[in-house]
Interface confidence: low
């Protein structure tokens, strides 16, 4: 007689990351009997929702249902039907919705309300949609990468599961770059966190962690670009903006109304004698870098040390995982290798930005021009943010690891968020230790 495979005793969870530029749905899976173990949850699917972020639906909320359909249907296919009703679904919205809420709490609530109604129509166990704080975004990103790197397990492994993993239990810091905000989170070395807003205390698997975190709203790469354009157009003599952050020969028309649509450009807003202006790229890394630095106010600091804009930042400590747009941009520019020094990265950026737009379009024919045109700015912005904003140096650059996935799971806040909401990270070390981690690591 044929041996029948026993049904897998597994559980699933779904998290939607409603970011400023797009929404992604992640499906996680884990063995039911090992819920409290570290490192057992892994990502089985990512579905990128077609279209912009949910904050863009403010004037067309009736379309949110259709927008979410494809990915929610995909979840229905991936997760066995027998598991649907017990699979939790969480939606967390980040800085795009934080910005919308700053403009109008009522509009943000309306968008979330329609999102909730749409997600409630599916056979899963919908647990709610909410705007997570910048502090949560930083904290959950830190939990995700350290969980996936095995930093919370008490067993020290004699082998390494990822190239940049050290065998000690020192946690990695987390650097997250989105479209509208950026987060820095790490455990400082014996340093008091001088500003209470930036301090988090965790007890995970029997160990205490004092964590520093800050989320810089408006300093995600897309909002930083809007800020830079708004700042630079103030001093333009006419409706032509010669911009060093775009390739020579690149041209793009910008509506002034679009420029001032976001709260992030309010500080630069002025009455201009034109409704539109044209960006004309001149492709100069050094000038682009200088222009970006003007977005960081480093002239005042009420603490022993600051990042920028008067925000406390302790001395950097240990290794850092840089993910989300830090990774996507550097991956596109082929600069994620551990062997590439900061000087080399700067050199490559100088060459890249100086390349004519026509040449760039030919070299990267398959890439959407909207994205392609912004890699010079984004790469330069990443360097400026890490070096001048967070005070990494040429020496400490080697402690930054550009990470897309760890063990097949995306680095980002969503896994940490789900682990927390499903109570899968115990405060104390579980008493019964499973036979061997090696079977599911």
């Amino acid at each position: 007689t044929q041996n029948k495979a026993l049904p897998e005793n597994v559980k699933y969870g779904i998290v939607l990351d409603a970011g400023s530029s797009h929404t992604s749905l992640y499906i996680y899976k884990w063995p039911a009997e090992k819920e409290n173990d570290t490192g057992v949850v892994h990502q089985v699917e990512e579905c990128r929702v077609k279209g912009p972020g949910i904050s863009k639906f403010v004037q067309k909320v009736n379309e949110i249902g259709i927008y979410l359909t494809d990915c929610m249907e995909r979840a229905r296919e991936v997760i066995p039907r027998s598991q649907h009703q017990e699979t939790p679904v969480y939606l967390g919205a980040t800085a795009g919705m934080r910005l919308l809420r700053m403009e109008s709490e009522e509009l943000a609530d309306r968008v979330l309300d329609v999102v909730e109604r749409s997600l409630s129509n599916y056979p899963f166990d919908f647990q709610g949609a909410r705007i997570i704080t910048g502090q949560e975004e930083g904290a959950y990103g830190w939990i995700t990468i350290n969980y996936l790197l095995g930093k919370f397990s008490q067993k020290t492994r004699w082998f390494s599961i990822v190239p940049y993993e050290t065998n000690n239990q020192e946690t990695f810091g987390a650097l997250d770059l989105g479209g509208a905000s950026t987060q820095v989170t790490f455990v400082p070395q014996n340093q008091t966190i001088e500003s209470p807003d930036n301090a988090l205390q965790f007890r995970l698997y029997g160990k205490d962690y004092n964590v520093y975190t800050h989320s810089f709203l408006c300093y995600g790469k897309d909002q930083a670009l809007w800020q830079k354009l708004a700042k630079d157009i103030q001093v333009a003599s006419n409706e032509i903006l010669r911009d060093p952050c775009f390739h020579p020969g690149y041209k793009k028309v910008v509506n002034v109304s679009d420029l001032y649509k976001t709260p992030c450009t309010k500080r630069f807003e002025m009455t201009l004698p034109f409704q539109q202006f044209e960006i004309q790229g001149i492709g100069n890394y050094q000038q682009c870098h200088q222009s970006i630095l003007e977005l960081f106010n480093t002239s005042y600091c009420p603490y022993s040390q600051c990042a920028f804009n008067g925000i406390f930042l302790p001395p950097l400590q240990g290794d850092f995982g840089a993910f989300s747009a830090f990774y996507f941009v550097m991956k596109f520019l082929n600069l994620t290798s551990e062997k590439v020094s900061q000087e080399k990265v700067t050199e490559m950026m100088k060459k890249f930005c100086a390349q004519p737009w026509e040449e760039i379009k030919t070299s990267y024919a398959g890439v959407k021009e909207k994205y392609l045109s912004e890699y010079c700015f984004s790469g330069t912005y990443i360097l400026s943010l890490l070096l001048q904003g967070y005070h990494f140096t040429a020496d400490s650059w080697e402690h930054i690891h550009f990470i897309g996935k760890i063990q097949g799971s995306d680095a980002g806040w969503t896994l940490g968020y789900m682990l927390n909401l499903t109570n899968m990270i115990p405060a104390e070390q579980p008493l019964s230790t499973p036979l061997s981690h090696s079977t599911y690591v």
């Epitope: 912009p52 379309e63 670009l225 509506n255």
Partner: nanobody, 135 residues
């Protein structure tokens, strides 16, 4: 002065043909996604044909597939819509639109479906040209 100017509309019998042009001045069309839309009497404005900026891919609404052909002439800074086998239900004001949005990573829907979501991605419009198909 930045503008899009459509021309080529008019009265035509069912089964006939027309060629619409959309000329841009003040900016170069080849950098942008361009679409043809139409607004039929009493109906919402709908996408007819969408030309992607990155690879020149052209999408058509199901109702015009096989009958309408969009093209662009970058040297003349003009896009065209060749309309064959016209039907009375093609009667509408035809607009060309450019996606000039500086919104980074605002992933425009290029399939020429999506109603107002599609319309919202195009932020610069011509004044329109009337096409009437009648015997």
């Amino acid at each position: 002065q930045l503008q899009l100017v459509e021309s080529g509309g008019g009265l035509v019998q069912p089964g006939g043909s027309l060629r619409l042009s959309c000329a841009a001045s003040g900016f170069t069309l080849d950098y942008y996604a361009i679409a043809w839309f139409r607004q039929r009497p009493g109906k919402e404005r709908e996408g007819v044909s969408c030309i992607s900026s990155s690879n020149g891919n052209i999408n058509y609404a199901d109702s015009v597939k096989g009958r309408f052909t969009a093209s662009r002439d970058n040297a003349k800074n003009t896009v065209y819509l060749q309309m064959n086998s016209l039907k009375p239900e093609d009667t509408a004001v035809y607009y060309c639109a450019a996606d000039l949005s500086a919104a980074p990573y605002n992933d425009a829907v290029r399939s020429c479906t999506g109603g107002s979501r599609l319309r919202a991605t195009y932020d610069f419009w011509g004044q329109g040209t009337q096409v009437t198909v009648s015997s």
